[in-house]
Each structure stands twice: as C-alpha cells, then as structure tokens.
C-alpha cells in the first residue's frame, strides 16, 4: 500500500552532469544543458517528484512526473520506462507499482541517488547511450557501483 | 535453505575442456545470479564470471573470456561452467555460488555471494 | 578493473586478543564489500555484507566499517574456532575482485 505525500519539483542530472528532459515525443532523455538551458527548457527539464508513504518501508517510494500541457507520469510497465498521460494517484492499494520507485541515496554519498522499481528487483533506473540519444531506461543490475545507475537531484522549489 | 550440489572431481589432459555442473536444491527466490569462483591448490579467491539464468546474459573475468562458457538449464535448475584448452595452471577447486541481493534496514540492495557449493577438483595433468 | 589489496597476509594471535584484517580498494566501491571466512577444504562462508552488516547466524564479536576505499573486518576477542582463510570481495563493478586473503592462525 502506498499512500502519498508531499512533492517537490526537481532537476536530475545523471553523473556526467547531463540534465533529464522530456522531448517533443514524450521521450525522457539526457543533454548537456547550461542552466540558462535548463531554464528555458522548463517545464520540460522540472520533475515534480511525488513522494509516498509505503505500508512495508523501503526507501523512500516516489512517482515522477512532469507537467507540459498535462501531468505525465514515469512508468517501468513491462520494464520499458515510458511516460503516461496521468496524475499519481493518492493511494495505491498494492505493494508494488509501475509508477513508483524507490529512491535511496549511494552509499555513503547522500548527494547521489539510485531509483529501484518497485515492481522489479535489481532494476534500476539508467542512463544508457543509444546511437545519438541518451536514454533514461530500466535496466536490470548487479554490479551497482555502475555510475549509470546514478543521478543528483537538485531541488527547486 | 538453499543447497548447490556440484559434480564430482574431474581429471584431464592438458588441452582437454572440462564441464563442472552446480545442481541447486531448496527454495530460491528469482532475481539470483551463478558465480563462479576458483581457488588453485594453497591460493586466493579469483572470480571466473556469472551468468543471469533469467535471459542467459554472461560477463567473464577478461582472463578467461575465450576459454570459458557458462550456461544454466532452468527446467532442471543447473548451472554448468566448461573450461576449454586446459593447462596445468587451471588445476583448482572450482565452486558456483549464488549471487542475490540482502537489504539493509532502509531497503538498500547490497548483492552477496550466499549459498556456495561444496567445490569441485580439476587436475590438469600429462 | 578495482583491485583489492589486503593485509596482513598471515597473522597469529591468542585466544581473546583483538584481530583487525584491513582491505584497500584502487577506486570508491560504496560500501559494496563483503567478507568471508574459509575453513581447509571447505567452501567460503559468508561472515559481513554491505561493508558492515552482519550475516545471520555469524557471532558478534566479527564486525566490518569502512567506507570509500579503506575497509576493516574487526574480531573483537578471538575464539579457537575463528581460525582460517579471510577474504575481502568488492562487488561495486565487475569484474569482481576479491582481497589476496589474510590466514589467521591461533597461537
């Protein structure tokens, strides 16, 4: 069960200090951005990150979501990671979701967070190179001092 | 409590391959990987490489990544590592070992080597 | 690859003394270390996870800190029992790599 809390708006970066936005087609995707960039990039590179209280603790169960011209929400369905047109919910009545990861900082570094599905173990979110793009992606892992299972979150509220 | 059951003591040619079987017994929960470990006669530890039973995916030690193969056979729940052109440097104790995630208080993963089998002997003599 | 060097590679002590085995990691390995301990001819067993959590079952007086790159598996008042091969193993990245291992031997 997991019921919700508070939220914060966000920028995350992965740790080549590349910022996440959501593209033109609902992408979420990784680019070099100045903060003049990231700026005039918003809302598109803000995260409004929707946090949950969780009936089993965890770590600290959030919802990412965006709002562009209507709230979009991070999905791992089938472990593809997608964006889908809807608000989080405010009680979710089961112990695992599609939309809800936990977000625990790396060990002995508070500043750098790691985000676990909470419907698959040992997946985490990614940054992964494809062609041009760099990808946010699901991926399932076990050698997790992997820095594309790594991502700073600045807080902008 | 989860057992690995290995095959037995192997001797071999040099050049000969040689194929080690890690049977597992007992519940075990999905989301393991198969290590698999060495230890030559009055030496250390030396990580051979894993296998991931749920899409087959490998990585090996760079050191052994032309002579070694790992494969797993979920019908019967059984881990195999074969060795290729064997020399008498890769006479050891080979052991699999299962490779899961523990949590700390705060849900943390922290992957370990658990449950171990209880080693196989290969000689590699003429 | 993150190499892994331990130390001491032997150490005798007496019953009730205070043991410490250190491992030295080439590169931060965020506290994904784990210890074992190694009876002759028998397979590792293992002893701390996590740099500093105990294993069920494993007795108090084995304890693990460290963080970073410097690691420490601490026993606090030695038993006869405790006598045997130690070995640190970093699981951050592969390849995995595992401490040259430290004999313990009972005086």
């Known amino acids: 069960y997991f019921g919700k809390l508070e939220s914060k708006l966000s920028i995350i970066r992965n740790l080549n200090d590349q910022v996440l936005f959501i593209d033109q087609g609902n992408r979420p995707l990784f680019e070099d951005m100045t903060d003049s960039d990231c700026r005039d990039n918003a809302p598109r590179t803000i995260f409004i990150i929707n946090m949950y209280k969780d009936s089993q603790p965890r770590g600290m169960a959030v919802a990412i979501s965006v709002k562009c011209e209507k709230i979009s929400t991070l999905s791992c369905e089938n472990r593809i990671i997608s964006f889908k047109e809807m608000n989080p919910p405010d009680n979710i009545k089961d112990t695992k979701s599609d939309i809800i990861f936990f977000q625990r900082s790396v060990p002995g570094h508070d500043n750098k967070m790691q985000f676990e599905s909470s419907s698959y173990e040992g997946y985490f979110l990614a940054c992964e190179k494809e062609r041009d793009l760099y990808k946010l992606i699901l991926k399932k892992k076990d050698e997790l001092g992997d820095r594309s299972i790594m991502f700073t979150v600045q807080n902008e509220d | 409590q989860v057992q690995l059951v290995q095959s037995g003591a192997e001797v071999k040619k040099p050049g000969a391959s040689v194929k080690v079987s890690c049977k597992v017994s007992g519940e075990i929960s999905t989301g393991y990987y198969f290590h698999w470990v060495r230890q030559a006669p009055g030496k250390g530890l030396e990580w051979m490489g894993r296998i991931d039973p749920e899409d087959d995916s490998t990585k090996y030690a760079e050191r052994f990544k032309d002579r070694v193969t790992m494969t797993e056979d979920t019908s019967t729940d059984t881990a195999y590592m074969e060795l290729s052109s064997l020399r008498s440097e890769d006479t050891a104790v080979y052991y699999c070992?299962?490779?899961?995630?523990?949590?700390?208080?705060?849900?943390?993963?922290?992957?370990?080597?658990?449950?171990w089998g209880q080693g196989t002997l290969v000689t590699v003599s003429s | 690859d993150i190499q892994m060097t331990q130390s001491p590679s032997s150490v005798s002590a007496s019953v009730g003394d205070r043991v410490t085995i250190t491992c030295l990691a080439s590169e931060d390995i965020y506290t994904y270390l784990t210890w074992y301990q190694q009876k002759p001819g028998k397979a590792p067993q293992l002893l701390i996870y996590g740099a500093n959590k105990l294993q069920d079952g494993v007795p108090s007086r084995f304890s693990g800190s460290g963080s970073g790159t410097d690691y420490t598996l601490t026993i606090s008042s030695l038993q006869p029992e405790d006598e045997g091969d130690y070995y640190c193993l970093q699981g951050s990245k592969f390849p995995l790599t595992f401490g040259q291992g430290t004999k313990l031997e009972i005086k």
């Open positions: 070992t299962t490779w899961r995630i523990y949590r700390d208080s705060s849900g943390r993963p922290f992957y370990v080597m658990d449950a």
